[in-house]
């Protein structure tokens, strides 16, 4: 991905009970599985047609999985996050970040990129002003005619 | 999205082998998990076995005659076919999902997998 590219972030506690087949999610990441350049982070890769997560819909690709049950994700191989997922009980509560992409291309989840996010207001002041200053000149030009 | 490519199917003598390649596109294939399916005329598409990041299984109907492998430098998965019967005789598919079941360790549902090959033939006399 060429030039910067700039995320709104947002947290959740999303609560899941287990289906007849699981949660119906696959993850990547992990300390010996890095998706995201510089995160060991647990990403969902993955949503399950019909699966738990997917009827729910609150799940995204592209979304970071800080805990299950309350338990950090940080600094797990890859293999040991997806043992923690399948021994978590019929009940799953997870903590979610999801990254919302709002410059640098349409508005849509990220499964990669650069992790970092910005506040709302470095978004939403620019847009304010440059309405004031179209409304501004639409005035002037209103009052010359 | 990630495009699969198999090669190395053909005609071959009962008892005999083969190697199907199966070589994928994406810069993370490291993490994807792969399965091989097979679909004999007017039959359902067969689980053969998958490959994931932390081990590999066959399907009982070909369990200890064929094995999976991958090399994550090439992006391509092999299955190695040995013993092979009549039986055998299908069109044989590779399929990718990116990441890891956190519901099953070998996903054999056609279902758990997005991407698919165009299948190569295998014909055993």
């Known amino acids: 991905m060429n030039g910067r590219v700039d995320y709104l972030v947002t947290e959740e506690e999303i609560n899941l009970t287990r289906g007849p087949s699981g949660l119906g999610f696959n993850i990547v990441g992990g300390t010996d599985q890095q998706y995201v350049s510089n995160d060991s982070g647990i990403y969902v890769s993955r949503i399950k047609e019909n699966g738990a997560a997917a009827l729910d819909g609150r799940l995204q690709e592209g979304d970071k999985i800080l805990s299950v049950n309350g338990q950090d994700l940080k600094n797990l191989l890859h293999q040991d996050a997806v043992d923690l997922f399948r021994n978590a009980g019929y009940a799953v509560s997870l903590r979610v970040q999801h990254r919302l992409q709002v410059q640098n291309g349409p508005i849509g989840h990220r499964g990669e990129g650069d992790p970092s996010g910005i506040p709302i207001f470095m978004v939403l002041v620019p847009v304010f002003a440059l309405t004031m200053v179209a409304a501004w000149a639409f005035m002037r030009y209103r009052q010359q005619l | 999205d990630v495009q699969l490519v198999e090669s190395g199917g053909g005609l071959v003598q009962a008892g005999g082998s083969l190697r199907l390649s199966c070589a994928a596109s994406?810069?993370?294939?490291?993490?994807?998990?792969l399965g091989w399916f097979r679909q004999a005329p007017g039959k359902e598409r067969e689980f053969v076995g998958t490959?994931?990041?932390?081990?590999?299984s066959t399907a009982d109907s070909v369990k200890g005659r064929f094995t999976i492998s991958r090399d994550n430098a090439k992006n391509t998965v092999y299955l190695q076919m040995n013993s092979l019967k009549p039986e055998d005789t299908a069109v044989y598919y590779c399929?990718?999902?990116?990441?890891?079941?956190?519901?099953?360790?070998?996903?054999?549902?056609?279902?758990?997998?997005?991407?698919w090959g165009q299948g190569t033939q295998v014909t055993v006399s």
């Open positions: 399929a990718a999902a990116i990441g890891s079941s956190v519901d099953s360790d070998y996903p054999s549902d056609p279902l758990e997998y997005d991407y």
């Open positions: 490959i994931t990041w932390s081990g590999s």
């Open positions: 994406g810069r993370t294939f490291s993490t994807y998990t």
